[in-house]
Interface confidence: low
């Protein structure tokens, strides 16, 4: 836990001769801002720098080179990572005065003369003076208003609804605020605000519509920040509906939207009497045209076994909404044909999922599958490979007899997915050929021996033994084996 | 306008001692800012070395921190830094450089045009 | 330390193209990024601050953007001043670091 930052000078005021220089320096164990009581836009005599020291704490000064009743206000110093929207500031604070003969009261924004209360609650009326010396008095139709008064703060009190005025004397001089206007509000202790974009993917040419509606709140603000708003590109509409309660539904609209109107799009609602803040936001996006984007689950080569159920699953991202289809080996699937069905469903606003289901697996499944996804704009297509897995098994096994020569060739043929893979063994004791320890293995480089092997399509070999001479009653067995299984044979 | 201009000897012994001066015209270095030098080795990328700020309060990369030392010597508005037992590795173009800390954020406005030091026997 | 990585490391691009170079930083390092462009045998000069600022004098065809721990710097049409090697460099923690540099080259 960091102690709380210390402010230089060590003061809880301070008053500041008009027009002169002040300088106000905040030390802290971590990185620290200021907060003061200008905008932005009014402080370019108001300058934040951080400063090096020894002392191993981080120093940031706030400067001002000429003191005017704007001036006048809390500052506050504060660590970077404690500040929060909703929270007022942590910190350490001065308030500075700036008496200007001439402005006896700081200066305010025109909403700062809005005061709005709740049924008897009690409210602030924000006339602060810009010397802690002035009296102040507050004044309605009815004449004095007795409130409690504090320069830093103004006039507190529990008002009826009406015009109030401050008023101050400076030096003989007598000084009137311009009216402010308290108003009773009926409002929630907090804000209930939704947000609805029915669509969050548009393409050029096309009107972003978002709304947010404001619930049990009679007079809210409600401002929106959106790519095209500097520009004043989008429409706003307030619409109030009363029955069965109060709702206010604030409508933004984008006409002729271009990929310059992508971005967030933020409604923020501010209750008028309380600092109740809410905040919705999604994310719009804009393409140039329409498109479509594919993403298989799975890669451009899969097997399936033989009787197996399989689902391939295709995610497909597009706008406008895509026509899904699938072909095999380029033809369309006819689903009532085949133990094969497809479906599209709906995940999200562009977001759409495709399934191609084998439910009994067939060698005539093997081939190629595409799904082709197609809207208006764009027309993209994925193609993979389908395998059906078949364990080997042997088809044939025969010998063939060279005559006179005395060579003999044995032939073995084998099926199956992948291509089965052939070996040979021998025998040389036919007595004993029942125990399986008196089977060898043929080697490749026994010289009188040869052995080959090909394939004759997808799912077909042929493997072959030449002896060039036979002078013993041998057995020979033929081993067809892959992935899924191994069968053999002898003779 | 504030110019920095880098000063000393190009050749050094291992183990000797590095010694290079910036001098500071148009501008007092007890006014403002951090006064930094920055190496940059043949053919490679930038390193930081370290600053003696306006009050005189010093910084070091952590990486050289025992062997560097940065001075100024007000009077003649020039800051120097010295590096010992200096190797191979040290051999770089050293750059003084004025360090801004407007915007509360720090960055290396102006520069000196740099200086070559070779370490070799 | 903060480590600052760039990309690519070189690039050849023509005098009219669009040059877009990115940094990484080891570490969040909010929008604390400066971009330097330096000449060979010239010292650094100061483009950009503060992620996206631009440096008095700079010209507005180069623009930075980023925050977090990836930044870009784009040049959106290349002028024959602008071959050089350009760096990043993190202000968000001691000791600063810079990238390893992109040179850019003519075409």
């Known amino acids: 836990q960091l102690s709380l930052p210390s402010i230089l000078p060590n003061e809880n005021e301070k008053v500041v001769q008009l027009n002169s220089s002040f300088s106000l320096r905040c030390f802290g164990e971590s990185e620290v801002s200021w907060q003061y009581p200008m905008s932005e836009e009014e402080s370019s005599d108001v300058e934040i720098r951080n400063e090096e020291n020894n002392s191993g704490l981080f120093v940031t000064v706030l400067e001002v080179s000429s003191a005017s009743a704007a001036h006048t206000g809390l500052y506050t110093c504060y660590y970077n990572h404690t500040q929060t929207e909703e929270n007022e500031l942590e910190g350490r604070h001065i308030y500075i005065y700036v008496p200007d003969p001439d402005v006896a009261f700081v200066p305010l924004g025109m909403t700062d003369y809005l005061v709005i209360v709740e049924d008897d609650d009690s409210a602030i009326i924000p006339c602060r003076t810009t010397d802690p010396e002035t009296p102040v008095t507050l004044h309605n139709s009815e004449g004095v208003v007795p409130a409690s008064y504090d320069s830093r703060q103004g006039f507190n009190g529990t008002f009826t609804v009406g015009p109030y005025i401050c008023e101050a004397t400076v030096k003989g001089k007598k000084f009137q605020t311009i009216p402010f206007n308290v108003y009773a509000l009926k409002a929630t202790s907090e804000l209930d605000l939704e947000m609805e974009a029915l669509k969050t993917v548009y393409k050029s040419g096309e009107t972003i519509v978002v709304t947010c509606a404001v619930f049990n709140n009679e007079v809210v603000d409600l401002q929106w920040t959106y790519p095209g708003e500097v520009k004043g590109k989008g429409i706003t509409m307030l619409e109030e509906i009363k029955v069965p309660s109060i709702k206010l539904v604030y409508t933004l609209t984008v006409p002729e939207a271009t990929v310059k109107d992508s971005g967030d799009y933020e409604c923020a609602a501010r209750q008028a009497t309380r600092e109740v803040k809410e905040m919705k936001k999604v994310t719009i996006s804009v393409h140039e045209k329409g498109f479509i984007e594919i993403k298989p689950t799975f890669s451009q080569l899969e097997a399936v076994n033989l009787h197996e159920v399989k689902h391939f699953v295709v995610e497909v991202r597009a706008y406008p909404p895509p026509r899904i289809s699938w072909l095999k080996n380029n033809l369309t699937l006819i689903e009532n044909l085949t133990e094969i069905t497809t479906d599209v469903e709906k995940i999200q606003e562009i977001r759409y999922r495709s399934k191609l289901k084998l439910i009994r697996a067939k060698e005539e499944d093997s081939g190629h599958y595409t799904i082709v996804a197609q809207n208006e704009d764009a027309v993209k297509s994925y193609t993979f490979e389908l395998l059906t897995q078949v364990p080997s098994s042997i088809l044939d096994l025969v010998d063939d007899h060279h005559g006179s020569t005395g060579g003999q060739t044995v032939r073995c043929t084998a099926e199956g997915t992948p291509l089965p893979d052939i070996e040979w063994m021998i025998c040389k004791d036919i007595k004993k050929c029942n125990n399986e320890t008196s089977w060898t293995i043929l080697a490749n480089n026994v010289s009188n021996i040869i052995t080959e092997i090909h394939s004759r399509d997808r799912s077909t070999v042929e493997g072959r033994v030449t002896f060039a001479k036979v002078e013993e009653t041998i057995a020979v067995r033929c081993l067809a084996k892959n992935l899924l299984g191994a069968e053999n044979r002898e003779l | 306008d504030v110019q920095l201009q880098e000063s000393g000897p190009g050749l050094v012994k291992p183990s000797q001692t590095l010694s290079l001066t910036c001098t500071v015209s148009?501008?007092?270095?007890?006014?403002?800012?951090?006064w930094n030098w920055i190496r940059q080795p043949p053919g490679k990328g930038l390193e930081w070395v370290g600053y003696i700020s306006y009050s005189g309060s010093t910084s070091y990369n952590p990486s050289l921190k025992s062997r560097i030392s940065i001075t100024r010597d007000t009077s003649k508005n020039q800051f120097s830094l010295k590096l010992s037992s200096v190797t191979a590795a040290d051999t770089a173009v050293y750059y003084c450089?004025?360090?801004?800390?407007?915007?509360?954020?720090?960055?290396?406005?102006?520069w000196g045009a740099g200086t070559t030091v070779t370490v070799s026997s | 330390d903060i480590q600052m990585n760039q990309s690519p490391s070189s690039v050849s691009a023509s005098v009219g193209d669009r040059v877009t170079i990115t940094c990484h930083a080891s570490q969040n390092i909010h929008v604390w990024l400066t971009w330097y462009q330096q000449k060979p045998g010239k010292a650094p000069k100061l483009l950009i601050y503060k992620a996206s600022n631009l440096h008095t004098g700079v010209p507005s065809r180069f623009s930075g953007s980023g925050s977090g721990t990836d930044f870009t710097l784009t040049i959106s049409s290349l002028q024959p001043e602008d071959f050089a090697t350009y760096y990043c460099q993190q202000g968000q923690s001691y000791p600063w670091t810079f990238g390893g540099g992109t040179k850019l080259e003519i075409k």
């Open positions: 450089a004025r360090r801004d800390y407007r915007y509360g954020y720090w960055y290396f406005d102006v």
């Open positions: 148009g501008y007092s270095i007890t006014s403002d800012y951090a």
